[in-house]
Amino acid sequence: MMTGTIETTGNISAEKGGSIILQCHLSSTTAQVTQVNWEQQDQLLAICNADLGWHISPSFKDRVAPGPGLGLTLQSLTVNDTGEYFCIYHTYPDGTYTGRIFLEVLESSVAEHGARFQIP
């Protein structure tokens, strides 16, 4: 029986050109996390494998950085990055847990002040 729950950063509104961190956290289960996939729509952005570490998809290498933790940092945001992102936790013995985050990327004058963040 799958008892775990995924907590996410929550939906985010950010500025074009800025950076944001997408994070998920799996709780309420003792299952072992074997791999975390990050996807947008049907595109694979990155994989964090418990044994093999991180793999960033070649098409995102310039703008996606691994971490912090099992999270993902998106840099040099464009309006085209607007959409839904999925963290997919592969666990044993529970199976797969999925978290969802919607990211809205806006022109600089529109995005909220709280989302004008740059990764230090």
Partner: antibody
Framework: EVQLQQSGPELVKPGASMKISCKAS????????MNWVKQSHGDNLEWIGL????????SYNLKFKGKATLTVDKSSSTAYMELLSLTSEDSAVYYC????????????WGQGTSVTVSS | DVVVTQTPLSLPVSFGDQVSISCRSS???????????LSWYLHKPGQSPQLLIY???NRFSGVPDRFSGSGSGTDFTLKISTIKPEDLGMYYC?????????FGGGTKLEIK
């Protein structure tokens, strides 16, 4: 003036599919998300999903995945929702609603399209 | 999904009354950057829902200042300071922080 004009009421047979349109005017269509909301009997409001006209990206309430398909035609500033394999449970009023930038709210709503599924 | 609970279900009022509607969520609506996406809507019979308040406390364009929103975390309140005839209808809160967005069950504001 922002306006969302939806297609008219529909009476459809069980098992059929249908498409509702939502024509946007008075703003830059590709700059805002378009949401779809179901109002069923008992005044219940449910978010069906949204589409990003700029890139065609979608987000669905999993309850409606496989039931609703969202598309846009940028050239006519029109959003569409196709409802598949209709049953009596799908009888409702459906609204399109523009996403309010940066606050994940819905600022302008269409007038609603009433869908009745009956044989 | 985040469960949003509105109270009361029904609110009988007299014109001129001040009322409060409560909205509670099953988890915090603050995202990791401290932004909270909670909005309020009025749905009058035969009309489309209309946005009243967004981002907890911001009044939408054209909304009278007798409407105000407050709260944080999981507890939110809509206050109407002086009820007028045009305020009657169903009020809904909506959380937009977590996917999928979810509405409260609604509060019917009606005449006593």
């Amino acid at each position: 003036e922002v306006q969302l004009q939806q297609s008219g009421p529909e009476l459809v047979k069980p098992g059929a599919s249908m498409k509702i349109s939502c024509k946007a005017s008075g703003y830059s269509f590709t700059g805002y998300t378009m949401n779809w909301v179901k109002q069923s009997h008992g005044d219940n409001l449910e978010w069906i999903g949204l589409i990003v006209p700029y890139n065609g990206g979608t987000s669905y309430n999993l309850k409606f995945k496989g039931k609703a398909t969202l598309t846009v035609d940028k050239s006519s500033s029109t959003a569409y929702m196709e409802l598949l394999s209709l049953t009596s449970e799908d009888s409702a009023v459906y609204y399109c609603a523009r996403g309010l930038q940066r606050f994940y709210a819905m600022d302008y709503w269409g007038q609603g399209t009433s869908v009745t599924v009956s044989s | 999904d985040v469960v949003v609970t509105q109270t009361p279900l029904s609110l009988p009022v007299s014109f001129g009354d001040q009322v409060s509607i409560s909205c509670r969520s099953s988890q915090s609506l603050a995202n990791s950057y401290g932004n909270t996406y909670l909005s309020w809507y009025l749905h009058k019979p035969g009309q489309s829902p209309q946005l009243l308040i967004y981002g907890i406390s911001n009044r939408f364009s054209g909304v009278p200042d007798r409407f105000s929103g407050s709260g944080s975390g999981t507890d939110f309140t809509l206050k109407i300071s002086t009820i007028k005839p045009e305020d009657l209808g169903m009020y809904y809160c909506l959380q937009g922080t977590h996917q999928p967005p979810t509405f409260g069950g609604g509060t019917k504001l009606e005449i006593k």
